[in-house]
């Protein structure tokens, strides 16, 4: 922490300007009034403070606002945002998308995923839901940031907003997030024709249940292998060889390349080798002919 000293009269600060870069850390601590700093935060980013000096300014703001900074200060943090921890950000109440944009620009390219995720979380909480304007801002200024939100937060996305989400915005989404988003997407795109529907729903299919994947197999969609590999393991395992062949169409040959990777490997283990042989791909590991398959999970459920 910065040591406390009294401010020499000739060093008294009446406005935030470039003269402050010549102040030593203890002089900044003693001479800069935190309320003045907060009122003139918009000037700070244009002044070439060192990172050490920025630490002192942050310390002053922390003392002035122990419960969290007001949005008038947050909006003008500029590169001081790089000094913020997720714990700092968790105290904020942010409702303005201009604030969000400003800080996303600053954090671009930095190792700040935890801070950005917390910031976005605060914006969603502050605005009450993940509305279209927020989603548009995220997709424009922070591709992939949508997936930094928890499933609980994503549940506040109205289906009407799903159309604004682009495939690349979902690249880093995990299964739990797609589980939340998929039903919304299904609802949002339900009135589209088959091929148009598939194009739109494809990025969300990592959250699709078996019955929906089976339904797609009846629609000649020719699913690409990359999409198939992102399907939930639980959704793929019950599919028959015929259903997978219909689902993938000409892309079925790609199964050989992915033979050792989940969910293909796990699916192969559940199929009869005879059925796999009909694909003519040389897939191995299926259930040998003449073996009886006992589903013990059903018996356990009954007992």
């Amino acid at each position: 922490d910065v040591e406390r000293t009294t401010c020499p009269p000739e060093k008294e600060v009446h406005e935030i300007d470039e003269s402050l870069i010549f102040y030593k850390k203890r002089e900044l601590e003693a001479c800069v009034d935190a309320a003045l700093l907060a009122a003139q935060m918009d000037r700070v980013d244009a002044i070439p403070f060192t990172y050490e000096q920025l630490d002192v300014l942050k310390h002053k703001l922390d003392e002035l606002y122990p419960q969290g900074y007001p949005e008038s200060v947050i909006r003008h943090l500029g590169h001081l945002f790089l000094k913020m921890s997720p714990e700092d950000i968790r105290k904020w109440n942010v409702t303005s998308l201009e604030t969000l944009k400003a800080l996303l620009k600053v954090s671009k390219g930095h190792e700040m995923s935890a801070q950005v995720a917390t910031l976005i979380d605060r914006v969603v909480v502050g605005r009450g839901q993940l509305d279209k304007d927020t989603v548009d801002t995220l997709t424009a200024f922070c591709p992939g940031c949508l997936c930094s939100l928890s499933p609980e937060r994503l549940s506040s996305v109205p289906p009407s907003v799903i159309g604004a989400v682009r495939p690349q915005d979902l690249d880093t989404c995990g299964p739990r997030q797609l589980d939340v988003l998929y039903p919304k997407a299904r609802l949002a795109f339900q009135n589209m024709s088959g091929s148009e529907y598939f194009v739109k729903i494809r990025p969300f299919l990592g959250g699709a249940p078996t019955e929906d994947v089976k339904a797609l197999s009846q629609q000649n969609v020719s699913m690409d292998l990359a999409t198939f590999m992102k399907l939930r393991r639980e959704a793929v395992l019950p599919l028959t060889v015929a259903e997978v062949q219909k689902l993938l169409g000409p892309h079925v040959e790609g199964l050989k390349v992915e033979e050792q990777h989940s969910p293909v490997r796990d699916w192969i283990l559940k199929q009869r080798q005879d059925d796999l042989d009909t694909l003519g791909l040389g897939l191995q590991g299926g259930i040998p002919n003449g073996y009886l398959i006992l589903d013990l999970s059903v018996r356990e459920a009954l007992s």
């Epitope: 060192t50 990172y51 050490e52 590169h79 790089l82 671009k108 390219g109 930095h110």
Partner: nanobody, 119 residues
Framework: QLQLVESGGGLVQPGGSLRLSCAAS????????MGWYRQGPGNERELVAV???????SYADSVKGRFAISMDNDKHTVYLQMDSLKPEDTAVYYC?????????????WGQGTQVTVSS
């Protein structure tokens, strides 16, 4: 990362001149400001002059009117022209650069170059 190498220091008589240079290499993109600091015998390191990437210069009161800082953006080099040197300007002069953006934000320092003003 960003490397800074100073040159141009030496021994000079009071009233004389020296020109210090500091060349940046490595991650030179997004340098937002470069400056010169000095540390005299028994003193703390203090900022002498700084120039932003937009060419705006600021000087410590003790060197105003005697020192001039300039930056060659193409060569990623900052210069400090020191005229009317005084014995109290004797110090190790350090070049400083700070980057506010990716990939390595932070303050960067050179190894220092000795300036001695003495008759």
């Amino acid at each position: 990362q960003l490397q800074l190498v100073e040159s141009g220091g030496g021994l000079v008589q009071p009233g004389g001149s020296l020109r210090l240079s500091c060349a940046a290499s490595g991650s030179v993109n997004s340098i937002t400001a470069m400056g010169w600091y000095r540390q005299g015998p028994g003193n703390e390191r203090e900022l002498v002059a700084v120039i932003t990437d937009r060419g705006r210069a600021s000087y410590a009161d003790s060197v105003k009117g005697r020192f001039a800082i300039s930056m060659d953006n193409d060569k990623h080099t900052v210069y400090l022209q020191m005229d009317s040197l005084k014995p109290e300007d004797t110090a190790v002069y350090y070049c400083n650069a700070h980057r506010r953006t990716w990939p390595h934000p932070g303050d960067y320092w050179g190894q220092g170059t000795q300036v001695t003003v003495s008759s």
